[in-house]
């Protein structure tokens, strides 16, 4: 268990042209408040999916009236932190939505009117117990500066708030099987704490805060025996004579789901199924529409004309997420062909092509031999983006312009002497060797180990390599 804390530092016009008009005026004074919604993990969740990690609403800020003619300054903020308690482990990765709301205080019929000024969203990694993390997010012409952290509530500690600590009972060391609680070396790890009220006889837990029942027992706290007798209703009658015990209060008792949501029990708690146009853990959040500007980074809002219809953000290339809030590493898709280097410039992708290739994605293989002549009877061979000449005998170099020394590579084996010849090279073999490159030993009895010497050539005679 622990608390996610959000501190809003400022909300005002962002840098650059097109400063927003002040949301308040002398005729229509207003004040701001903020809402934060947290979801676990970095998965792409729909904007209307529940704030499964929790949500919180700030207090109202001071009443603000625009000074005529003045640009919108940083607006006065509510005091204090937004705190979102979490009951289970801190997930380490989370998604957030922070909404800035305006409460208009003019002579509204039926009380104050609320409107959404800005919404920012993002996905972050955060270890519990770490320092405050600072962030700046822009929504249109507005800029929100804030800090956040996750801290564990005693006795929980650790980056996920899953380790439990308690003060040492003995000054020197912890009890059997329990380690010191780094960094709180004066405390010891405690055994798991199950859900409050979990039956010590019939319940157990493998994770902090859960309550799992032994066979024969049921209910959120494992206090209800599983009966074989027939009960009048799934929850059991109030009379004990039928053999069914009245269960303890269930998580859906009193229906925690607002706005007509229906409640269903889950192994750990409850779940609200919300009507269209509402979302949140308890269906407490009314639907977001395209008019609220939920699509970031140039996303186009499709559908969602009214709270009863969900919107979809069509994201520009390079962004994804239900609100186009997540940048995609477009180079990870390896769009550049033929070994081109990928550059994601944000507004566009660029491919830096290897020699011999061209096109936006290096898809065109240039004709390497076009306009390239190989001298002295050489032929041009394309390959790998660079032309190569296959040279006629006796020539070498990139364009076959250099006279080749055929003996430079010392081609004659076993001490044979090399002689350059108009048609190639000639090896004069040392005694006991034969072959074009003097590669074959001559057997002592005069028979060669491999092909016989051509007629008219004795072993040891120079062999011309054609």
């Amino acid at each position: 268990a622990g608390v996610f804390e959000l501190q809003i530092h400022s909300f005002g016009p962002g840098p650059g042209p097109g400063a927003p008009r002040s949301p308040c005026s002398a005729r229509l004074p207003c004040r701001l408040f903020f809402r934060v919604c947290l979801k676990p993990g970095l998965s792409e969740e729909a904007a209307e999916s529940p704030c499964a990690l929790g949500a919180a609403l700030s207090a109202r800020g001071p009443v603000y009236t625009e000074q005529p003619g003045a640009p919108a300054p940083d607006l006065p903020l509510p005091d204090g932190l937004l705190q979102v308690p979490f009951r289970d482990a801190w997930p380490g990765t989370f998604s957030f939505i922070i909404e800035t709301w305006r409460e208009e205080l003019g002579d509204q019929i039926g009380g104050p009117a609320w409107s959404l000024l800005a919404r920012v969203a993002g996905r972050r990694r955060l270890a519990a117990g770490g320092p405050w993390a600072r962030d700046i997010q822009r929504a249109g012409a507005w800029e929100l500066r804030f800090s956040y952290r996750a801290r564990c509530e005693p006795p929980a500690v650790g980056t996920a708030c899953t380790r439990l600590c308690r003060p040492r009972s003995a000054p020197s060391r912890c009890g059997p099987g329990l380690r010191p609680c780094a960094p709180l070396e004066d405390e010891c790890e405690a055994p798991l704490v199950c859900r409050a009220g979990c039956s010590p006889e019939h319940g157990f837990c493998e994770q902090p805060g859960e309550c799992r029942c032994l066979e024969g027992w049921t209910g959120p706290l494992c206090t209800v025996p599983v009966s074989t007798s027939s009960c009048l209703s799934p929850r059991g009658p109030s009379s004990a004579t039928t053999g069914c015990l009245v269960p303890g209060p269930g998580p859906c008792d009193g229906n925690p789901c607002a706005n007509g949501g229906s409640c269903s029990e889950t192994p750990r708690s409850f779940e609200c199924t919300c009507p269209r146009g509402f979302y949140g853990l308890r269906c407490e959040v009314s639907g977001v529409t395209c008019a609220d500007g939920p699509c970031f980074n140039g996303g186009l809002c499709v559908g969602g004309a009214d709270p009863d219809s969900a919107y979809i953000c069509h994201c520009p290339p390079g962004f994804q997420g239900s609100n186009c809030e997540k940048r995609v590493d477009r180079c990870s898709l390896q769009p550049c062909r033929n070994g081109g280097l990928c550059l994601d410039l944000g507004h566009a992708l660029r491919c830096r092509c290897r020699a011999g290739f061209a096109g936006p994605r290096c898809e065109h293989d240039l004709d390497d031999c076009a306009g390239r002549a190989c001298a002295n009877g050489g032929t041009c061979v394309e390959g790998g983006g660079a032309h190569r000449c296959s040279c006629a005998l006796g020539f070498g170099g990139r364009d076959c312009r250099e006279r080749a020394d055929p003996c430079a590579a010392r081609p004659c084996a076993h001490g044979g002497r090399c002689y350059a010849h108009f048609s190639g090279l000639v090896c004069a073999c040392a005694p006991g060797y034969m072959g074009a490159r003097c590669e074959f030993p001559v057997h002592p009895d005069g028979a060669s180990a491999l092909p016989a010497a051509p007629p008219g050539l004795r072993p040891g005679d120079p062999q011309r390599y054609l």
Partner: antibody, heavy 118, light 108 residues
Framework: QVQLQESGPGLVKPSETLSLSCTVS????????WSWIRQPPGKGLEWIGY???????NYKSSLKSRVTISLDTSKKQFSLNLDSVTAADTAVYYC????????????WGQGTLVTVSS | EIVLTQSPGTLSLSPGERATLSCRAS???????LAWYQQKPGQAPRFLIY???SRATGIPDRFSGSGSGTDFTLTISRLEPEDFAVYYC?????????FGQGTRLEIK
């Protein structure tokens, strides 16, 4: 430099299907959304719809029942089909690339006039 | 759908003068997702401004855009002869994408 070129018949009979193609050069067709916009003679611009290589499409609701936009990455082309045309569909039809930072139109074809007449 | 109304319908000015073209939306345009285009007779529109105030590549700095919410402005600081054309605004925050009806900028 990105270039777009519309092609297709300039005259279509009422109740028939208007079919246009747009050939893209100088850019990867997989990297952007591609759109059709039309402009009746002497009037303003009207967005018809767009497509992305992933298959995502979006059409103007008043035309949705009659419009299909498709894309052929191998030919570097995307196409517009508009069914059951009437004289009100007479317009210059433009194909355009949707920009990298939002759904504005940063490159346009030169346009092709399609007249619906018997 | 978001209806964009441009004013004036026609603006008559001389080269060297300053032109101010207005585009008003029937409801707030998300995150200032508004673009401006220039169109000359017989030609395709030319992309000028996106995000209400960001100039497209190659657009001279005499063109500037401003505004947010429902009121947007395109300003041409010193008119050149080639600037006389029809100008359209377009919002791309909410589907359907919509254009204004255009403002004709003509030589006085």
């Amino acid at each position: 430099q990105v270039q777009l070129q519309e092609s297709g018949p300039g005259l279509v009979k009422p109740s028939e299907t208007l079919s246009l193609s747009c050939t893209v050069s100088g850019d990867s067709i997989r990297s952007y959304y591609w759109s059709w916009i039309r402009q009746p003679p002497g009037k303003g611009l009207e967005w018809i719809g767009y497509i992305y290589y992933s298959g995502t499409t979006n059409y103007k609701s008043s035309l949705k029942s009659r419009v299909t936009i498709s894309l052929d990455t191998s030919k570097k082309q995307f196409s517009l089909n508009l069914d059951s045309v009437t004289a009100a569909d007479t317009a210059v039809y433009y194909c355009a690339r949707i920009g990298p930072a939002g759904f504005y139109f940063d490159y346009w074809g030169q346009g092709t006039l399609v007249t619906v007449s018997s | 759908e978001i209806v964009l109304t441009q004013s004036p319908g026609t603006l008559s000015l001389s080269p060297g003068e300053r032109a101010t073209l207005s585009c008003r939306a029937s409801q707030s345009v998300s995150r200032s997702y508004l673009a401006w285009y220039q169109q000359k007779p017989g030609q395709a529109p030319r992309f000028l401004i996106y995000g209400a105030s960001s100039r497209a590549t190659g657009i001279p700095d005499r063109f500037s855009g401003s505004g947010s919410g429902t009121d947007f402005t395109l300003t041409i600081s010193r008119l050149e002869p080639e600037d006389f054309a029809v100008y359209y605004c377009q919002q791309y925050g909410t589907s359907p994408i919509t254009f204004g009806q255009g403002t004709r900028l003509e030589i006085k």
